[in-house]
Interface confidence: medium
């Protein structure tokens, strides 16, 4: 498959200069998140505001390597986590079958050239399962809850403004209905969605020549190599950062 080795550019697909410069990039993360024991969660980071070329993204928990997404070689999941960690969406990481021991700090480390490394921090709290809920289900992170709260506040403000301006009742219902629809749309971008906003997988054309055009037969050779060093050909490492 052609995505065994991807052609990857960062920052508007511009080649980074060889000379090292100021580190201007910023990492946006999902911040502090909570999830239920036995459930799943997506850890997401996003690098923006830099012209540096992203070469590798590492995911760590405290001092342990969880996974690596490498521009040339794709995903590597640490053998001790391979049963509970899945790559993606994008450069994110999905943690499954959560236990209370998974509570703690997680780091995404973006290796870039020529900037160096950018590190993002996420704090995950795994909560005991609620009353009769079992099995893996995705939790809405605190960011999602905050967004929902904002939507509710906005709704209230708009309703109050609408009422004070003595708009027609019909119009008020229309606005509320509209907002309800928008709110439902936002919930679709919860961590269970395949590619939430801020995901690093953007549909962008990558110029040929960065890592070399790959032919189908290369995949078999790569697969062998992955087996030797416990790499898993798990899908694309699509590195892309937005100019911000």
């Amino acid at each position: 498959m052609r995505w065994c080795l991807l052609l990857i550019w960062a920052q508007g697909l511009r080649q980074a200069p060889l000379a090292s410069g100021m580190m201007t990039g910023t990492i946006e993360t999902t911040g502090n998140i909570s999830a239920e024991k036995g459930g799943s969660i997506i850890l997401q980071c996003h690098l923006s505001s830099t012209t540096a070329q992203v070469t590798q993204v590492n995911w760590e928990q405290q001092d342990q390597l969880l996974a690596i997404c490498n521009a040339d070689l794709g995903w590597h999941i640490s053998p001790s986590f391979k049963d509970r960690v899945a790559p993606g969406p994008g450069l994110g990481l999905t943690l499954q079958s959560l236990t209370v021991n998974d509570t703690g700090e997680y780091f995404c480390i973006y290796h870039t050239y020529p900037d160096g490394t950018y590190t993002g921090r996420i704090f995950l709290e795994v909560l005991e399962s609620s009353v009769a809920e079992h099995g893996a289900r995705f939790q809405i992170p605190l960011l999602g809850a905050m967004a929902a709260t904002l939507v509710v506040i906005c709704t209230a403000v708009i309703v109050v403004v609408a009422l004070t301006r003595k708009k027609k009742a019909l119009r008020i219902h229309s606005v509320e209905g509209d907002l309800r629809r928008k709110s439902a749309g936002q919930e679709e971008w919860s961590p269970s969605a395949p590619s939430p906003p801020g995901s690093c997988v953007q549909a962008e054309a990558a110029p040929a020549g960065l890592c070399g055009e790959q032919r189908g037969e290369d995949c078999a050779e790569l697969h062998d190599y992955f087996n030797v060093l416990s790499y898993r050909s798990l899908g694309n490492c699509s590195f892309f950062t937005e100019t911000g």
Epitope: A16, L18, S20, Q56, D72, D218, Y225
Partner: antibody, heavy 119, light 110 residues
């Protein structure tokens, strides 16, 4: 099978230049970072230089900066090390090593080529 | 160029467990992966351990790696005569933009 074969070593005088080559086979060359690592007689390993798979990024040890240049020709599956202003301290076996990327590891090594700088 | 610190020599008798230390690894998150290499006399180095504690296929499980903070160690259990070799640790240093190798440890099987 992955194979790395170095060539170009030999005896040179101080101040002279030499170009080492490393012919790679058995893997997709353009997908791997490559490094040169040297070992002076009876001494330990010393990393010399690294180049990314696409040839965009290159890194050097302080001891060789400004004198050595690493390059690669992905169409020929060959890695190069251009060594200028050689001194006796550069005398060593030079190994070509395949990497995954900067902070990973060297998974395959060549047998090495000996460079002797002597007057 | 600074190097990682290893004891110059280590020894053990067949069947014993030997540990080789490596200190001076970058404490910066994301740059602290250690790999270990075995160099038998007159041969090229061979990858033994990668990403601190992972073994490539073909490397016996007698070899194990661990890392804590800025130090790492290589343990060899059930020592065998063919383990007599030089052992090197290596790690990338992001502040130097350079690979660092330990000075090497010569393991002697008595």
């Amino acid at each position: 099978d992955v194979q790395l074969v170095e060539s170009g070593g030999g005896v040179v005088r101080p101040g002279e230049s030499l170009r080492l080559s490393c012919a790679a086979s058995g893997f997709t060359f353009s997908s791997h970072a490559m490094s040169w690592v040297r070992q002076a007689p009876g001494e330990g390993l010393e990393w010399v230089s690294l180049i990314s798979g696409n040839g965009v990024s290159a890194y050097y040890a302080d001891s060789v900066k400004g004198r050595f240049t690493i390059s690669r020709d992905n169409s020929k599956n060959t890695l190069y090390l251009q060594m200028n202003s050689l001194s006796a301290e550069d005398t060593a076996i030079y190994y070509c090593a395949r990497g995954t990327y900067l902070i990973s590891f060297f998974d395959y090594w060549g047998l090495g080529t000996l460079v002797t700088v002597s007057s | 160029q600074s190097v990682l610190t290893q004891p110059p020599s280590a020894s053990g008798t067949p069947g014993q467990r030997v540990t080789i230390s490596c200190s001076g690894i970058s404490a910066k998150i994301g740059n602290n992966y250690v790999s270990w290499y075995q160099q038998l006399p007159g041969t090229a180095p061979k990858l033994l351990i990668y990403f601190n504690n992972q073994r490539p296929s073909g490397v016996p499980d007698r070899f194990s790696g661990s890392k804590s903070g800025t130090s790492a160690s290589l343990a060899i259990s059930g020592l065998q005569s063919e383990d007599e070799a030089d052992y090197y640790c290596a790690s990338w240093d992001d502040s130097l933009n350079a690979w660092l190798f330990g000075g090497g440890t010569k393991l002697t099987v008595l």
